[in-house]
């Protein structure tokens, strides 16, 4: 195999490998016809200039996992025909300014994971061929203007995980082509006007986890093909009308953990792909009228963890599709009887811990498909009569930790219960609070003697007319939904925590988060 | 370690129903979407369905759409299929999946069951 | 939906060969893009995510590239046990359709 080292194995296709701790220098000599070079998992600190010259025929070099320092300027002279070059996961911290002027026909460069401080405004500038830029997890406090501008060939940049405040609006003025921008867990506290306006193909732009804490109102106007936008952890209050107007093929939308006080009528749309958004975590305090109007083909709508005192009879209009709505950990105090009623498809709602004093009769008039319904942590005393009785899917009830009145009007409720005892779990059963004679007896099984017929509850009464719930959850609810952000250790957790791994870490949801 | 278990598949007339159940094993399953995907004999795979995590969002391909209903039970760490109307052209191994993704660009079907074969034929 | 083709739909090579892979989306997924392999009778395992990140404990000879609408599957140096059926598939939209799949057979 033209002089495989010792330290490397070599494939008669001319792909070279070496890896190992024991490698700490650049193994030599190199096969002549290597067209593939990986070196990972050693202890290589410094790339010197002379390694590379007599493997011109290299498509594909691989440098992941070592110790690498410092790289010469000419260690990669003579590699006319790389295509790929990966040096990610090192000890990189400068490049030198020409390292890649002799590397002009490369399609993807991956540097991420390194210590790069800076990147000079030249260094890029022979890549008219380059279609992924890989910069995730560096120190890189600014972009240089201009650093991109002959980059016009690239799709894919993840400028992740640095340290950088601020973008200059033209920074990415010549990346017409580029379809993924990721630019996460930074500290961007301002995007300027203009800034993504050149980026009409964009399709992915991701800016997660920064400090913005306004948009501007046509920030995206000119990403018409933007199909995900994540926006989640930041500390944005307010969102111009119109901010998503242009976005008619957008399929992600993830806007939890913000500031936002308060969401404008017509705000989302039309966003006819789009099917679950989550906007918990924030500081809402009402929803007006018409406020998803434009949703009409969503699914799942999280509002929980929000500070909701009041929701507009019109707030749900338009979204006919919706099978998940979760409004518990707010502030509600009551809710309009005609609040749900433009929801027919509705399966689970979640309105647990919030200050409910009362449900109107008609509250789940329209919603005849109801399988969860959580009310438990709010201030009930009672409910109306023949609140639950046209809901023949409902498999799960909570009402557990509410100040239930045991008085005689509790009867209509009381034998509700008992027919339907399956339905409220076996975990926590719903405790009367007041009189004082009966405090802290179950609401179900509890010997009501008030003047009236007495009625002994069953402990475990056959319900002929009770649905087939097979394939129906027992005991996990709607609490368990889409919430994804950091663990707190409060009794409403919404994530467990996940440590990233491999730039993959899951939407963790615990059971207990209620989302 | 994790682990996802395929059963209740079979032989059915064609008309006929079946359901499909996947045991999910060794992680947190209400972390997880979850999909069923399947493949006819000597074909391609298929995407068949999805659900999200609290089984809210649900979504289906349009060869079994009116037909197929996904659900899950966390309680139980259990995925289900209910196949009704069934049809020669449903005849295929039925894989459960994870569905695993982020904002960070993972997206994959990252953990898969060993299948459970299912016969339309009169 | 998204119509995901594939080509070659089989390909005869040998050990220690380089092949290569193509996927094409009739519109762009961005890198919403996975790659599979499969072994008769057994179930896909995940080779790639994001167009070309590795998914952890696959080997290295497997690599990924592409964005927008078209994708490529390396593999740098097959082994005998590569010899089997690839399927790329894609995750931008709903339904998540898979490609036709790719048979790699042994010359």
């Known amino acids: 195999y033209y002089g495989c080292p010792s330290e490397c194995t070599c494939s008669r296709a001319s792909q070279v490998e070496c890896t190992g701790a024991q490698i700490v220098a650049m193994p030599s000599p190199l096969p002549w016809n290597a067209m593939s070079l990986q070196i990972l998992n050693t202890h290589i600190t410094e790339l010197p200039e002379d390694k590379f010259l007599n493997i011109s025929a290299l498509i594909a070099l691989k440098m992941e996992k070592n110790e690498l320092a410092n790289i010469m300027p000419g260690a990669f002279r003579n590699l006319g025909s790389l295509r790929h070059l990966s040096l990610a996961n090192n000890k990189l911290k400068n490049l030198p300014v020409r390292l890649f002027q002799d590397v002009n026909n490369l399609e993807t460069l991956l540097l991420s994971n390194n210590q790069l401080v800076q990147i000079q405004p030249a260094q890029f500038s022979q890549f008219s061929n380059l279609k992924e830029l890989q910069l995730y997890g560096n120190n890189l406090e600014y972009i240089p203007e201009g650093v991109f501008d002959h980059l016009v060939g690239l799709t894919k940049l993840n400028l992740g995980n640095n340290g950088f405040t601020h973008l200059s609006p033209r920074v990415f003025q010549h990346l017409g082509n580029l379809q993924v921008l990721r630019l996460y867990e930074n500290r961007l506290s301002d995007i300027p006007m203009g800034t993504f306006d050149a980026l009409g193909n964009l399709q992915e732009l991701a800016l997660q986890e920064n400090q913005i804490g306004t948009l501007s109102p046509g920030l995206f106007h000119n990403n018409r093909n933007l199909q995900r936008l994540y926006l989640s952890n930041n500390h944005i209050s307010h969102l111009p009308p119109g901010i998503f107007m242009q976005l008619p093929h957008l399929n992600k939308l993830t806007l939890f953990g913000n500031s936002l006080k308060e969401l404008s009528p017509g705000v989302f749309g039309p966003m006819p792909n789009l099917r679950e958004l989550w906007l918990y975590n924030n500081h809402i305090t009402s929803l007006p009228d018409n406020a998803f109007s434009h949703l009409n083909q969503l699914q799942v709508l999280i509002l929980s963890h929000n500070q909701l005192s009041y929701i507009s009879p019109g707030a749900f209009n338009g979204l006919t599709n919706l099978r998940e709505l979760s409004l518990h950990t707010n502030a509600l105090q009551d809710l309009d009887g005609n609040v749900f009623r433009s929801l027919a498809n509705l399966r689970n709602v979640s309105l647990q811990n919030n200050r409910l004093r009362q449900l109107p009769g008609s509250i789940f008039a329209n919603v005849n498909g109801l399988m969860t319904i959580q009310l438990q942590n709010n201030n009930l005393e009672n409910l109306p009569l023949g609140i639950f009785d046209h809901l023949g899917n409902l498999c799960e009830l909570r009402l557990y930790d509410n100040p239930w009145r045991c008085d005689s009007n509790i009867l209509p409720l009381h034998d509700w219960l008992i027919l339907n005892r399956a339905r409220l779990g076996t975990d926590t059963l719903p405790v009367c609070s007041s009189p004082a004679s009966v405090r802290g007896q179950s609401l179900v099984i509890i010997n009501v003697n008030f003047p009236g017929p007495s009625v002994q509850g069953p402990e475990t009464p056959e319900v002929s007319s009770y649905p087939d719930t097979s394939s129906y959850p027992d005991s996990t609810s709607i609490s368990s939904t889409t919430e994804i952000t950091r663990s707190t250790d409060d009794d409403y957790t919404d994530l467990n925590t996940i440590e990233p791994i491999d730039d993959r870490n899951t939407w963790g949801m615990t059971d207990a988060q209620s989302g | 370690q994790v682990q996802l278990v395929e059963s209740g598949g079979g032989l059915v007339k064609p008309g006929g129903s079946l359901r499909l159940s996947c045991a999910a094993s060794?992680?947190?399953?209400?972390?997880?979407?979850m999909s069923w995907i399947r493949q006819a004999p000597r074909k391609g795979l298929e995407w068949v369905s999805s659900?999200?995590?609290?089984?809210?969002?649900?979504y289906y391909a349009d060869s079994v759409k009116g037909r197929f209903s996904i659900s899950r039970d966390n309680a139980k760490n259990s995925l289900y299929l209910q196949m009704n109307s069934l049809r020669a052209e449903d005849t295929a191994v039925y894989y459960c999946?994870?569905?695993?993704?982020?904002?960070?660009?993972?997206?994959?079907?990252?953990?898969w069951g060993q299948g459970t074969m299912v016969t339309v034929s009169s | 939906d998204i119509v995901m083709t594939q080509s070659p739909s089989s390909l005869s090579a040998s050990v220690g060969d380089r092949v290569t892979i193509t996927c094409r989306a009739s519109?762009?997924?961005?890198?919403?893009l996975a790659w599979y392999q499969q072994k008769p009778g057994k179930a896909p395992k995940i080779l790639i995510y994001?167009?070309?990140s590795l998914e952890s404990g696959v080997p290295s000879r497997f690599s990924g590239s592409g964005s927008g609408t078209d994708f490529t599957l390396t593999i740098s140096s097959l082994l005998p046990e590569d010899f089997v059926t690839y399927y790329c598939?894609?995750?931008?939209?709903?339904?998540?359709?898979f490609g036709p799949g790719t048979k790699v057979e042994i010359k």
């Open positions: 999946a994870r569905y695993n993704w982020n904002d960070r660009g993972y997206d994959a079907f990252d953990i």
């Open positions: 060794g992680f947190t399953f209400s972390d997880y979407y």
């Open positions: 659900i999200s995590n609290s089984g809210g969002a649900i």
């Open positions: 519109q762009g997924i961005s890198s919403a």
């Open positions: 994001d167009a070309s």
């Open positions: 598939q894609q995750f931008n939209s709903y339904p998540h359709t």
